[in-house]
Amino acid sequence: EPCVEVVPNITYQCMELNFYKIPDNLPFSTKNLDLSFNPLRHLGSYSFFSFPELQVLDLSRCEIQTIEDGAYQSLSHLSTLILTGNPIQSLALGAFSGLSSLQKLVAVETNLASLENFPIGHLKTLKELNVAHNLIQSFKLPEYFSNLTNLEHLDLSSNKIQSIYCTDLRVLHQMPLLNLSLDLSLNPMNFIQPGAFKEIRLHKLTLRNNFDSLNVMKTCIQGLAGLEVHRLVLGEFRNEGNLEKFDKSALEGLCNLTIEEFRLAYLDYYLDDIIDLFNCLTNVSSFSLVSVTIERVKDFSYNFGWQHLELVNCKFGQFPTLKLKSLKRLTFTSNKGGNAFSEVDLPSLEFLDLSRNGLSFKGCCSQSDFGTTSLKYLDLSFNGVITMSSNFLGLEQLEHLDFQHSNLKQMSEFSVFLSLRNLIYLDISHTHTRVAFNGIFNGLSSLEVLKMAGNSFQENFLPDIFTELRNLTFLDLSQCQLEQLSPTAFNSLSSLQVLNMSHNNFFSLDTFPYKCLNSLQVLDYSLNHIMTSKKQELQHFPSSLAFLNLTQNDFACTCEHQSFLQWIKDQRQLLVEVERMECATPSDKQGMPVLSLNITCQMNK
Amino acid sequence: QKQYWVCNSSDASISYTYCDKMQYPISINVNPCIELKRSKGLLHIFYIPRRDLKQLYFNLYITVNTMNLPKRKEVICRGSDDDYSFCRALKGETVNTTISFSFKGIKFSKGKYKCVVEAISGSPEEMLFCLEFVILHQPNSN
């Protein structure tokens, strides 16, 4: 069975084709080659001689036991080599020779027992080394690491490392890899020698499910003393063994580290006193809790110095009391419990993401809700009922506002967005909004993107509601049950580039409403019920138009519509996916491509 | 279509078939077997994925005695610092994991429950596997 040609001459997918040898019938120019799940078993020297341009090579699960000297010789452009799941028994010293551009090497689950004997010291361009899920017992980074000056990611997770000694990291003292991210999760650690990490700088250190008791965790974290880390991730996994006990003593050792950003990711334990628990983390710039349960929600009003707080997928008894002077960014998403939003006091806040919490807002939105006048980004999407009772007084700095898939109430009772003259992006898609007031978008003079799909309009008619939106470049009106539109609805939108009118209920097409759209490039009218044109003579769309989508409509392919069908043919160079433009009627022409119709009508009336 | 038996409990019998062309082998054990009246146990899965599990989610299509419930989407792996360790599993890497589960207080009516599980992962998204579970529920006297 031949390989699948994904991109001609470039990308070939040869997965699971029972190949015993490297195929020789693929073009020399191949850049991406997936040979995974083939029983190759043995790679001799110059195995890939036929593919000098290769950039990505996937050899996952190829039953490879032996890799000889120079197996990849000639692959001087290869940037990614994937060897996952091969039971390698013999790896020649020159196995990886010739890989002068290699940036990513994945040797996950390859029976690797030690980094010392892994022949990669010459791979100077290497940025990412993934040796997770192996049999490595020693964390000693061999001397050759001093050659790997570009290394940014080292994944040693799911190995057998139990202890870390001062000598293990000597090479990092000699040539500090300032940008190195190190993942040691799922190693059964019980000892980190104090001083092992002294004066070491890491970009990121991840330690999840490393400790089988609170005491071990405590002493190991104390062993990290002197480490300077940009981002520290601690925690567990839901499907691995979890700590039976967790208290404030666990993290006391963090006081001896310099940490910029901290994240606790999954803990099968109720956190009650977070002030004591995170006492050593009051001055990190970014603090993040993922998938934890928090009992006392008042603690977030303590004088933490965080600039970014992230609470994701957590459980709360009620919406937390948030009073944090220095906080600039708050991400509070996908949490459970506390369904009603309560006011927060965050005077420096500029970015607020409250999406996907099922929250309801009794009154939205003004400065008093968030305790700030600096807000630029507000995401309230995928929540419950949000009642609009104020038009963003004190929130005039907003540039990005997202309500999608929440249930907005009182949207047509006053000009909700009147204060938002700096707003650039607005998404009110699928918010149960029924537009019954022409002033709904008054005030939005800077708006560039408006998404309002999945709403409805009085009498299914689009009125002149966009008159002030002179900077609009993107407008989505799909799934709005629209049937008619004002001929002047779009007259002020001279900057509009993309207009999505798909999935509405138009029976006919009219070019007249678009005559002022001098910048329009994309017009999508797919999934309507267009049968013909509104007027006999259709004018041209704006000359800027590059893509016109009329697919999945109800074209009536009869002589009476000859001029419309001919007009469609004349637009051929604009039309996308023409094969999905089919006749719906009459029954003998149903399913025929509109563009293949021979429209020569004998008018036998 | 070959049917794979999972287990029997006092009130349920569970089996599955593949609903995709690939039919890549997957081993599923439940211990103890699920009782629909209330249950607590361990689900053990052994599987070698044909693509990375990053951003794994399930589409669930549940049928209760021929009545279709709305499609449910269950996100398992968000893409960074995920709850489950297998979320970091790569294409071709052995996934050998045990997941605890528990539920209680749901009353199910007697009959045939079908659940099509479409596993989608990766970027771009593609189907990882598709399994159709059949649960025959025979509530006992209490």
């Epitope: 299914n460 209920n505 109800d554 | -």
Partner: nanobody, 119 residues
Framework: EVQLVESGGGLVQAGGSLRLSCVAS????????MGWFRQAPGKERDIVAR????????YYAESVRGRFTISRDNAKNTVYLQMNSLRPEDTGVYYC????????????WGQGTQVTVSS
């Protein structure tokens, strides 16, 4: 399952009038487009008129424009076709059609009702 049942067909003289009715049962179709197709003897089935769920939009084939009127009563789940100034070429079987609530066009069909216009 949705069922469409037409009535009102029959024999009429040229210049006369008929009113066709179509009742939908099985589920409410108040939001979907409905319409009438005609199959004249020896010809293909083709659309005559169509109306949106809100009655805001209508479409008529050129041959019936000004003579036929499509309307609907959503409370009764019924769509009508008022046919005036009938001509012999209007003879045929008239079918009621409805889109699916998901938006698929011409998803449900009635069995048809015969209209014969004699000269």
């Amino acid at each position: 399952e949705v069922q469409l049942v037409e009535s009102g067909g029959g024999l009429v003289q040229a210049g006369g009038s008929l009113r066709l009715s179509c009742v939908a049962s099985g589920r409410t179709l108040s939001t979907v487009n409905m319409g009438w197709f005609r199959q004249a003897p020896g010809k293909e089935r083709d659309i005559v008129a169509r109306i949106s769920g809100s009655s805001v939009s209508t479409y008529y084939a050129e041959s019936v424009r000004g003579r036929f009127t499509i309307s609907r009563d959503n409370a009764k789940n019924t769509v009508y076709l008022q046919m005036n100034s009938l001509r012999p070429e209007d003879t045929g079987v008239y079918y009621c059609v409805a889109d699916s609530p998901g938006g698929r066009s011409y998803e449900y069909w009635g069995q048809g009702t015969q209209v014969t216009v004699s000269s």
